[in-house]
Interface confidence: low
């Protein structure tokens, strides 16, 4: 068990703060909830603290919760491939470029680390080149979320990881908006981190609303499990 992994044996409170600017539309989001890495479970509620969110909530799910991939459930035989927990408590920097097909792109930078007993994800997001009447700024996405696989590989040069995946957002007319994600994570601290073999995270997310919440918001339930590395031969013959 990595030293960081010991911090995730129970339920951990989560705080998410985002400052965003998409095509000049500026906004802030605050999120709170908890994560339980034993089950790979996240429960979070996000509120736009600046009024109405200028982009659809589903376009921010990867920035919020795929940002705290330290809550992913890594099976026993894969624990030596869990970069995310190994970087804690100092945390990691996570940067992404997200290309929305035939539309604009988001660039994000986040610091994910423990502040006291709370896991904090502080994010800056900049979006450019979006069409004002496109699927994103035109709010044409359905309020739901598909399951995805998130592909992880070591980046030995930067003592971190590179991550690639493609998100499929459902559009109200029945078509799909693709969003290509290019991600890199680097540790904030100087301590040793686990550099993984290639594997993936399998994600399932459910979006809902709080009937008592008047502000623009999103409630998120997510389960994430690591997969893609089989038991070694020594395991088979135990």
């Amino acid at each position: 068990m990595s030293k960081g992994e010991e911090l995730f044996t129970g339920v951990v409170p989560i705080l998410v703060e985002l400052d965003g600017d998409v095509n000049g539309h500026k906004f802030s989001v605050s999120g709170e909830g908890e994560g339980d890495a034993t089950y790979g479970k996240l429960t979070l509620k996000f509120i736009c603290t600046t009024g109405k969110l200028p982009v659809p909530w589903p376009t921010l799910v990867t920035t919020f919760s795929y940002g705290v991939q330290c809550f992913s459930r890594y099976p026993d035989h894969m624990k030596q491939h869990d970069f995310f927990k190994s970087a804690m408590p100092e945390g990691y920097v996570q940067e992404r470029t997200i290309f929305f097909k035939d539309d604009g792109n988001y660039k994000t930078r986040a610091e994910v680390k423990f502040e006291g007993d709370t896991l904090v994800n502080r994010i800056e997001l900049k979006g450019i080149d979006f069409k004002e009447d496109g699927n994103i700024l035109g709010h044409k996405l359905e309020y739901n979320y598909n399951s995805h696989n998130v592909y992880i590989m070591a980046d030995k040069q930067k003592n971190g990881i590179k991550v690639n995946f493609k998100i499929r957002h459902n559009i109200e007319d029945g078509s799909v908006q693709l969003a290509d994600h290019y991600q890199q994570n680097t540790p904030i601290g100087d301590g040793p981190v686990l550099l993984p073999d290639n594997h993936y995270l399998s994600t399932q997310s459910a979006l809902s609303k709080d009937p008592n919440e008047k502000r623009d918001h999103m409630v998120l339930l997510e389960f994430v499990t690591a997969a893609g590395i089989t038991h070694g031969m020594d395991e088979l013959y135990k």
């Epitope: 920097v93 940067e95 660039k107 930078r109 610091e111 800056e124 997001l125 900049k126 680097t186």
Partner: nanobody, 121 residues
């Protein structure tokens, strides 16, 4: 921007960027440079709120970025200049905190007109 000019290798220059219509006390201020035929590259950045600084590997230990909130000005002190530092230097500002590794010019909302720095051997 001001403070550019010509200097011998090993010399020093101090660039200044006075922001008008923009308050440097929050967000990110940065210096970029662009040599002829090359991509614009991030040199240094400072988070105005807490003073955290970031530097490109090529200038670490030689360049220092600083700010004076009272004068709404950001500085780039350049020491031990090398011919490879010859470029047009641009000041940039963002309302958001600095990106960790200076990668993206699109992060910044405001840009200066640039000042030429020439270092001869």
């Amino acid at each position: 921007e001001s403070g550019g000019g010509s200097v011998q290798a090993g010399g020093s220059l101090r660039l200044s960027c006075a922001a008008s219509g923009y308050t440097v006390s929050r967000g990110c201020m940065a210096w970029f440079r662009q040599a002829p035929g090359k991509e614009r590259e991030g040199v240094a950045a400072i988070n105005s709120g807490d003073g955290t600084t970031y530097y490109a590997d090529s200038v670490k230990g030689r360049f220092t970025i600083s700010q004076d909130n009272a004068k709404n000005t950001v500085y780039l002190q350049m020491n031990s200049l090398e011919p490879e530092d010859t470029s047009i230097y641009y000041c940039a500002a963002s309302r958001l905190r600095c990106p960790w590794n200076l990668v993206s010019a699109s992060w910044y909302d405001f840009w200066g007109q640039g000042t030429q720095v020439t270092v001869s051997s």
